[in-house]
């Protein structure tokens, strides 16, 4: 920044150094240079001399006016032309910023990913503010009435060990910057209701060449949660629409799910789970590809999820970039 220079006068901004984007602003420069009655005062923005909208107010002061200022950051400084001085003399400089007050944080969500040891709270921050915006996450026990506050710039991980006030909590988020402050709605949570099971992973697929060929998808999770509900979605890579199968699952053994698919087609599979009856789902697992054979049985395993040449062996490919699938890690 430009704020650490030695000044021979001073520079200030109206209405403020940080202001709402799109405002009209005035930058004032006042010289206080020994033995110098400035002939002229100059303004520079990001090192470039400004030519227009400069008004001389008195012998030592000038004003630069900007209409509808839209730059998030700029370094301003001003100089004086002093008689008998060959070069312009630096008066002072200032970093200015424009942006927006924060939106109300919404969609506040807190989850505990199994084995993480943390409660992760996220929210939709709204539109970009362009200026430094901080968030205070308030976590208040509904049982002990104790409140903890966590300062962050984005999301927050709170150790579950620090949640000593029982199982029921109130969570809300305050957003603040130099231009304003907003507060989210309050979220009430029960710690047992927000656990997301350990990720479900598809490990391999095989197509058995029976009278009607069937594809078996093998998938598993390291979860210790007993009652888990899962969804597997699949589609031909050329399709836009997913087919979804639902399962009530017991992960004491590897799951095997059967599908009757068209021959000689490349399919993509994903799985996600939640604790039965609870609020939040896992994000969808990474894309798993399997090409059904024309006639010969085949096996596709996770280890071979990459592009291969068709040499009569398993033909499997993965390239998440090729698919325009709804593969966001949604948890709601």
């Amino acid at each position: 920044g430009i704020t650490n220079i030695n000044c021979s006068g001073h520079i200030w901004v109206e209405p403020a150094t940080i202001f709402k984007m799109g405002m009209n602003i005035s930058i004032y420069c006042q010289a206080a240079i020994k033995n110098c009655q400035p002939r002229k005062l100059h303004f520079y923005k990001n090192g470039i001399k400004e030519r227009f909208q400069i008004t001389r107010i008195n012998k030592t002061t000038a004003r630069l006016w900007y209409k509808n200022f839209l730059e998030p950051h700029a370094s301003m400084y001003c100089t004086a032309e002093c008689p008998k001085h060959f070069q312009e003399t630096l008066i002072c400089g200032k970093d200015i910023s424009s942006g927006y007050p924060p939106d109300i944080p919404d969609e506040v969500t807190c989850v505990i990913y199994e084995y993480s040891g943390n409660m992760t709270c996220t929210w939709n921050a709204g539109k970009l503010t362009y200026i430094d915006t901080k968030y205070v996450v308030h976590v208040k026990s509904l049982e002990t009435e104790e409140e903890q506050q966590y300062l962050t710039s984005s999301y927050i991980n709170i150790s579950t060990d620090s949640l000593q006030g029982g199982k029921k909590y109130l969570v809300w988020v305050q957003a603040a910057n130099a231009l304003g402050m907003e507060e989210s709605k309050q979220l009430q949570i029960h710690l047992d209701d927000i656990v997301i099971p350990s990720a479900a992973v598809i490990s391999r697929a095989e197509t058995i060449n029976a009278t009607v060929p069937k594809t078996i998808i093998y998938w598993d999770s390291q979860t210790t949660i007993e009652k888990v509900s899962c969804e597997m979605r699949y589609k031909a890579t050329t399709n836009q629409t997913w087919n979804v199968k639902e399962f009530d699952t017991n992960f004491t053994y590897v799951q095997q799910s059967e599908f009757y698919l068209e021959p000689n087609i490349k399919y993509v599979f994903q799985v996600r789970c939640q604790e039965t009856g609870k609020r939040y789902w896992q994000p969808w697992s990474s894309l798993f590809f399997h090409k059904t054979p024309e006639t010969v049985p085949q096996v596709t395993s996770k280890a071979f999820q990459h592009d291969t040449w068709n040499s009569g062996l398993t033909v499997a490919s993965i390239s998440t970039g090729h698919l325009t699938s709804d593969n966001r890690g949604d948890i709601g």
Epitope: K140, L142, E145, L170, W172, K185, Q186, L187, Q188
Partner: nanobody
Framework: EVQLVESGGGLVQAGGSLRVSCLAS????????MAWYRQAPGKQRELVAS???????LYADSVKGRFTISRDSAKSMVYLQMNSLKPEDTAVYYC???????WGQGTQVTVSS
Amino acid sequence: EVQLVESGGGLVQAGGSLRVSCLASGNIVSRNVMAWYRQAPGKQRELVASVDTGGSTLYADSVKGRFTISRDSAKSMVYLQMNSLKPEDTAVYYCNVPRYGYWGQGTQVTVSS
């Protein structure tokens, strides 16, 4: 100054029902999680139930299936319907706004055996 005024307490026989109400000043009910707490003689105050602005609820294990919390934002009211009352439900019941720590003066509920 926010005011919370509870009403509807009284004496009831075990197995009976009672509905306590809380009238809040301003629009506090429409914007905040609202809760009922209770305090029995010689015991700590405890959460009974809470309800958020979307109507989602939390209950103490001891009242689950028997008590129902509800809200009417238009009337600035919060209710606690108590069924299958037991002698151990005897307490002063307080309306509360957890976000701000606002409390009512309480209403006495006595369940006789």
